[in-house]
């Protein structure tokens, strides 16, 4: 498999058959698949060097792994997008052997003197062809030469099979399956041959191709493949339940932010709640996690403005649940990214020198910002797309707080909507779905560059649009939701999560 190890070294060779038998639309589809693969790999913070070859009678090398920009995913994608099927029109035979020889030439080194670290570099060849080679001879001989060069299958104790993966995608109207199978790697419990119909569900294909065991702690990563559970799609999501004898129970959501902490809303708890009465589950697991302590933001005080006639005051409505035992990350349990951390800098593919302010400008620009939250409906987690009103609609969004029960007498809305809040909901630019009571404490998320970054914690809503946890279809335009802006509580997060290796900026 493609081992995505951010600290490792990898070369990926994209080889695309542009011969007559492929056809223009299949060529375009294959290109799209490769573009998606480049993006998927880049989303892991991995920076492989790419080689890019198209071929028919002759190969054409568009990107060499030795080029400075070959590890720049955006630049490689641009080169790929600029390739036309017509480029091989005049000489449109199929010489797959020559194309693989072009790959071999990129792999090999001058004077037979291998460079430092050559033996730690993994090589991945992704060949898109119909397998109908009609000139140049059998391409399998070049695969054998490549295996020799990389010393694969020669050392009984260290066969190095994981240093070469050859994936073959059958494209075109007619595919020679025998030829394709012969070229692809054969490894136990792995799939290296894919068909055209597989490419309709690329996430399923990538799931078969990628080994992410070295990057399970990466924040904000998800799997969207069809066989995935709700928690593959939102592996940070935590369900919180507080049992109060004789008073029923309170349900909330939260987000895994590190191996020991779940971030949620402070109002989910009261000072009387004992740790043993708080149930937290992650990854869709039945068992509850043991709680060590709940840490409230020191400035949170729901009764802080009772004298001023404000029954409930949600400023600084954030809490961290510290777990007794370390979480074991996997594909259904992994952290969400937090603002102003090194992990988010890498997730957004920003320079290492990026400041907290620059992250803020990237994630919360002064405009309507597409975001999402995760809600549970009929025992299924679903993503709800909303817009954070952070531009010209911000004022009107915040003013609608006056329609909230108990806030009708508030003279100055900034008394309840402090600078700590982000506002979503309403009908412009689109009709946003609203949060339900049980969504409280869950993350408000910005999805960028295939990664998920938490920017807020769901706190309170103007209108209870949910009866029995079912959202009403018709909701008033003033149905707004307010979320604690994580950029505004960073000193507290940084202090409480200082031992979690998140690298706060």
């Amino acid at each position: 498999k493609i081992v995505l190890d951010p600290s490792g070294s990898m070369n990926i060779y994209l080889v695309l058959d542009g011969s007559d038998s492929i056809g223009a639309s299949n060529f375009t589809g294959a290109k799209k698949c490769l573009v998606n693969l480049i993006e998927k790999v880049a989303s892991y913070g991995v920076k492989p060097r790419y080689g890019l070859v198209t071929y028919a009678t002759y190969p054409k090398i568009w990107v060499k792994v030795s080029e400075a920009d070959s590890s720049n995913a955006d630049w490689v994608t641009k080169q790929l997008n600029e390739i036309n099927y017509e480029d091989h029109k005049l000489k449109s035979g199929t010489n797959t052997k020559k194309a693989l020889q072009a790959v071999y030439s990129m792999m090999s080194w001058p004077d037979d003197v291998p460079p430092e670290g050559w033996n730690r570099t993994r090589h991945v060849i992704i060949l898109m062809t119909d397998g109908l080679h009609n000139m140049g001879g059998d391409p399998i001989t070049v695969i054998d030469e490549i295996r020799d060069l990389l010393y694969i299958g020669k050392d009984r104790k260290n066969p190095r099979e994981d240093y070469l993966d050859v994936y073959v995608f059958g494209v075109g109207p007619l595919v020679n399956q025998v030829n394709i199978n012969a070229l692809a790697s054969k490894k136990d419990n792995e799939q290296h041959v894919f068909k055209v119909k597989d490419m309709e569900n690329l996430e399923d294909v990538f799931y078969q191709m990628i080994d992410e065991s070295q990057s399970l702690s990466l924040c904000g990563m998800v799997w969207e493949h069809r066989k995935g559970t709700d928690y593959h799609k939102q592996p940070w999501q935590a369900k919180i339940s507080v049992i109060r004898p004789s008073k029923g129970h309170e349900s909330c959501m939260g987000a895994v932010v590190s191996e020991y902490f779940v971030l949620t809303a402070a109002h989910c708890f009261t000072v009387d709640d004992k740790e043993h009465s708080i149930k937290v589950s992650v990854g869709g697991e039945k068992r509850d996690l043991e709680i060590e302590v709940v840490l409230f933001h020191p400035n949170y005080n729901i009764n802080g403005k009772k004298e001023a006639g404000i029954p409930e005051f949600y400023d600084y409505d954030v809490a961290l649940i510290k777990l007794k035992n370390k979480l074991k990350y996997g594909q259904t349990i992994r952290p969400i990214c937090l603002p102003c951390t090194e992990g988010t800098t890498r997730a957004l593919r920003l320079p290492p020198t990026t400041t907290c302010q620059q992250q803020k400008e990237e994630l919360l620009p002064a405009q309507d910002i597409k975001a999402l939250f995760v809600s549970e409906e009929e025992k299924k987690l679903t993503r709800k797309e909303v817009y954070i009103k952070n531009g010209d609609k911000k004022g009107s969004c915040e003013r609608d707080a006056q329609y909230a029960p108990g806030y009708d007498k508030v003279k100055d809305i900034s008394e309840v909507v402090t600078p700590r809040f982000l506002c979503t909901g309403g009908v412009s630019p689109y009709a946003d779905p609203n949060t339900c009571r049980g969504d409280s404490g869950g993350p408000l998320i910005v999805h960028k560059r295939s990664r998920f970054i938490q920017v807020g914690v769901i706190s309170w809503g103007v209108v209870d649009v949910c009866k029995n946890q079912k959202r009403q279809k018709q909701v008033p335009a003033h149905a707004r939701d307010f979320h604690i802006n994580l950029f505004q509580v960073l000193p507290w997060l940084k202090e409480k999560l200082q031992d979690e290796d998140l690298g706060f900026l």
Epitope: K154, D155, K157
Partner: antibody, heavy 121, light 111 residues
Framework: EVQLVESGGGLVQPGGSLRLSCATS????????MSWVRQAPGKGLEWLGF??????????EYAASVKGRFTISRDNSKNTLYLQMNSLKTEDTAVYYC????????????WGQGTLVTVSS | EIVLTQSPATLSLSPGERATLGCKAS??????????MNWYQQKPGQAPRLLIY???NLESGIPARFSGSGSGTDFTLTISSLEPEDFAVYYC?????????FGQGTKLEIK
């Protein structure tokens, strides 16, 4: 055809030095471990050390009895293995063999004919 | 280091007889499903010759009357029917752990 030919043996005084060579042909030299083995007169075989193949950067490994005194090196451009022997003792008297150590099964599948080293005053 | 003890030190047999040579390791020479034990034959004035690798695999060009067996710490070289040219010294050698080590040898002589 695989061939290994040792040279450089001879008479040397205790405390002296000697460099043995093993010229090879018929195979891709850099892809193989290469070992030195010796046999004292009337005694059994003693493995001295090897030079690993290219994946491991040709790093050497030694038997405790010669560590610090003997050095194994190779010149891949000449397909030649070397054994530099310093601070020689009378008990180093032996026939010295170089052998190709096949990493496909970690066994010495080809041997040279041997070169005699005599350490005596 | 792994110490290999061969038995017997000397074995006297006649041509046509079956020879069984033993080799015991001070610790297991198995790794990842393979046993890294090899057998060599050496005749006077000649370099050793590989007979069996990885405990039971016959090196190419070696007659089928030679066979190897065993795993872990106990290994056997068997010559099913001795030919005159088989009388020599036989060494076992482990290549599982560095440093490699040889057994002290078993001398197979004509009775």
């Amino acid at each position: 055809e695989v061939q290994l030919v040792e040279s450089g043996g001879g008479l040397v005084q205790p405390g002296g030095s000697l460099r043995l060579s093993c010229a090879t042909s018929g195979f891709t030299f850099r892809d193989y471990y290469m070992s030195w083995v010796r046999q004292a007169p009337g005694k059994g075989l003693e493995w001295l050390g090897f030079s690993r193949h290219r994946v491991y950067g040709y790093t050497p490994e030694y038997a405790a009895s010669v560590k610090g005194r003997f050095t194994i090196s190779r010149d891949n451009s000449k397909n030649t293995l070397y054994l530099q022997m310093n601070s020689l003792k009378t008990e180093d008297t032996a026939v010295y063999y170089c052998a190709r150590d096949n990493p496909g099964y970690y066994a010495m599948d080809y041997w040279g004919q041997g070169t005699l080293v005599t350490v005596s005053s | 280091e792994i110490v290999l003890t061969q038995s017997p030190a000397t074995l006297s047999l006649s041509p046509g007889e079956r020879a069984t040579l033993g080799c015991k390791a001070s610790q297991s020479v198995d790794y990842d499903g393979d046993s890294y034990m090899n057998w060599y034959q050496q005749k006077p004035g000649q370099a050793p010759r590989l007979l069996i690798y990885a405990a039971s695999n016959l090196e190419s060009g070696i007659p089928a009357r030679f066979s190897g067996s065993g795993s872990g710490t106990d290994f056997t070289l068997t010559i099913s029917s001795l030919e005159p040219e088989d009388f020599a010294v036989y060494y076992c050698q482990q290549s599982n752990a560095d440093p490699y080590t040889f057994g002290q040898g078993t001398k197979l002589e004509i009775k």
